[in-house]
Interface confidence: low
């Protein structure tokens, strides 16, 4: 299709070489009130959607993204050619930074409902460059923690080296939705709740004598609790004896709950005690079976191909540990009568 009629937006992504930060492009199809590009029914004031990006289409996932090769080749479908770029509804997620992401990205509705819609598209010219400004070497992180129940703030990384007084007007989005009341380079949170977690985008406009462009940064905000003061507890096995059938296979599961730790380094392992000897058993990898803000439940199984008489004399011990301390639970096998 002819992209010469697309509205154009210029964006700058200045990435920190220090972090695996992400980036997003919204399909900012022009609002019908403001542009001749998209032919749509007018919205009454009450109907203005909270999604500023992509005002045009009723179905937010109904968008096609392309990249325009710099050599003039035909447009390429993003989904086929770029595994590190993921389309989620009307948003394009860049999973890894790098100057190779620079280029022109075009979005348009998949379904064209009238002849006027042919020109309903947006061309985004994205410039990507590493952060070189030494004076802002220690800008805000692209991953920020907020402690639940406390006050906190979310800083726009590209503006965190400027004072509030110098800062330009900032447009903030959370999970793609416009936060219309936020205009400064920092969002102040009076009390942190778990719903404050999410992907925040901050935009501001920069210009020179020739043109203007949008500077964008993406911040992953994680709400956390304080580090646990407790050692992990074993939820299973509860009993210290287990009835088994000789000659049959057996799986014993060890499930343990670990409280939140900023640096999470859980240990869960099985070892066997036989009279004076004890040794660690090679067992399948541990797996997380439930994860919440406050804790994580991890499971690790010991598998016996067949229970032998010798196993009845042994103790099977599950050992779990975090930075606070360790807990053990032993199981003695008993033949079913």
């Amino acid at each position: 299709f002819n992209i010469s009629g697309c509205s154009t937006k210029k964006l700058l992504w200045t990435y920190s070489t220090r972090s695996e930060e992400e980036f997003v492009l919204f399909c900012d199809l022009p609002e019908p009130q403001k542009s001749h590009f998209c032919h749509r029914n007018r919205l009454s004031p009450k109907q203005v959607p909270e999604h500023l990006p992509f005002m045009g289409s009723n179905d937010l996932s109904d968008v096609q993204w392309y990249q325009q090769p710099s050599n003039g080749d035909p447009l390429e479908d993003i989904r086929k050619s770029y595994p590190h770029i993921i389309q989620d509804k009307c948003t394009l997620h860049f999973l890894t930074p790098g100057v190779n992401n620079s280029g022109s990205y075009i979005c348009r509705p998949k379904m064209i409902k009238s002849p006027y819609d042919v020109a309903c598209c947006v061309k985004m010219i994205l410039e990507v460059k590493p952060q070189t400004n030494a004076s802002c070497e220690y800008s805000a992180s692209h991953k920020q923690d907020l402690l639940l129940g406390s006050t906190g703030s979310i800083s726009c990384p590209s503006l965190s080296c400027q004072s509030d007084a110098q800062s330009p007007a900032v447009t903030w989005y959370k999970n793609g939705k416009l936060l219309s009341v936020e205009r400064s380079n920092r969002i102040v949170v009076d009390e942190v709740y778990d719903y404050h977690q999410g992907t925040y985008v901050c935009d501001y406009t920069q210009s020179d004598t020739v043109s203007s462009w949008t500077v964008r940064a993406v911040v992953q905000v994680r709400t956390i609790v304080g580090d646990t003061k407790l050692k992990p507890d074993i939820l299973d096995p509860v009993e210290d004896t287990l009835e088994v059938e000789l000659g049959k296979p057996l799986t014993i599961s060890c499930k343990a709950r670990f409280g939140f730790e900023r640096v999470f380094n859980p240990v869960i392992k099985w070892y066997i005690k036989d009279s004076d000897l004890e040794w660690e058993v090679s067992v399948p990898e541990a797996k997380s079976i439930k994860s919440t803000l406050k804790d994580e439940i991890i499971e690790r199984n010991i598998i016996l191909e067949k229970v032998t008489q010798r196993d009845l004399r042994r103790k099977f011990v599950c050992f779990v540990q975090n930075s606070i301390g360790n807990t053990t639970q032993s199981v003695q096998l008993k033949e079913k009568r």
Epitope: S19, E20, E21, D145, S150, G152, G226, D227, V263, N265
Partner: antibody, heavy 124, light 107 residues
Framework: QVQLQQSGPGLVKPSETLSLTCTVS????????WSWIRQPPGKGLEWIGY???????NYNPSLKSRVTISVDTSKNQFSLKLSSVTAADTAVYYC??????????????????WGQGTTVTVSS | AIQLTQSPSSLSASVGDRVTITCRAS??????LAWYQQKPGKAPKFLIY???SLESGVPSRFSGSGSGTDFTLTISSLQPEDFATYYC?????????FGQGTRLEIK
Amino acid sequence: QVQLQQSGPGLVKPSETLSLTCTVSGGSINNYYWSWIRQPPGKGLEWIGYIFYSGTTNYNPSLKSRVTISVDTSKNQFSLKLSSVTAADTAVYYCARDVGIAARNSYYYVMDVWGQGTTVTVSS
Amino acid sequence: AIQLTQSPSSLSASVGDRVTITCRASQGISSALAWYQQKPGKAPKFLIYDASSLESGVPSRFSGSGSGTDFTLTISSLQPEDFATYYCQQFNSYPITFGQGTRLEIK
């Protein structure tokens, strides 16, 4: 640019409490973890503990019974108190910012901004 | 606590030399290791994180490698400003610990 300015006495008497303050300028204390580290004369570095802007702390077990780290977000500063000092606590004390470097599924922390260091001598 | 042992404790080298410093952890720490440079009377400066990722602005002659328990810091061609003490640091579990340091001096 974030800078850390340390203040506090350079001489402390045995059995007294060592008190140091670190003031953060050029950026907010919010959303970061802040550490204290010390270095005895001619020796290596020893981590004392950290504080999150909200007040959550974690201390080195070897010093835990004597250490208190506190934060004052309104003044953009955090402080170290070490009680019952002896000559073995003579060292250069540093404050530092712990920054979370983002790997996709985890955080990797390093101390990327340091204070200038304060030489504290414990002597009567 | 996880112990980090650096070797050698000190070494002499000339400008242009290739130098390798090793750091061994008392237990596996994945790649949660950083390297710092400290000059006399100054605070440490952070060079490498995640065992091998170079901090922005650090010259490319510095490189790190390793995983688990054995790690190395290599300076491919020593420059006059590289003579300093180097420390490794683990952030895999608390308490955070540092190696005892390796002093690099001019031959």
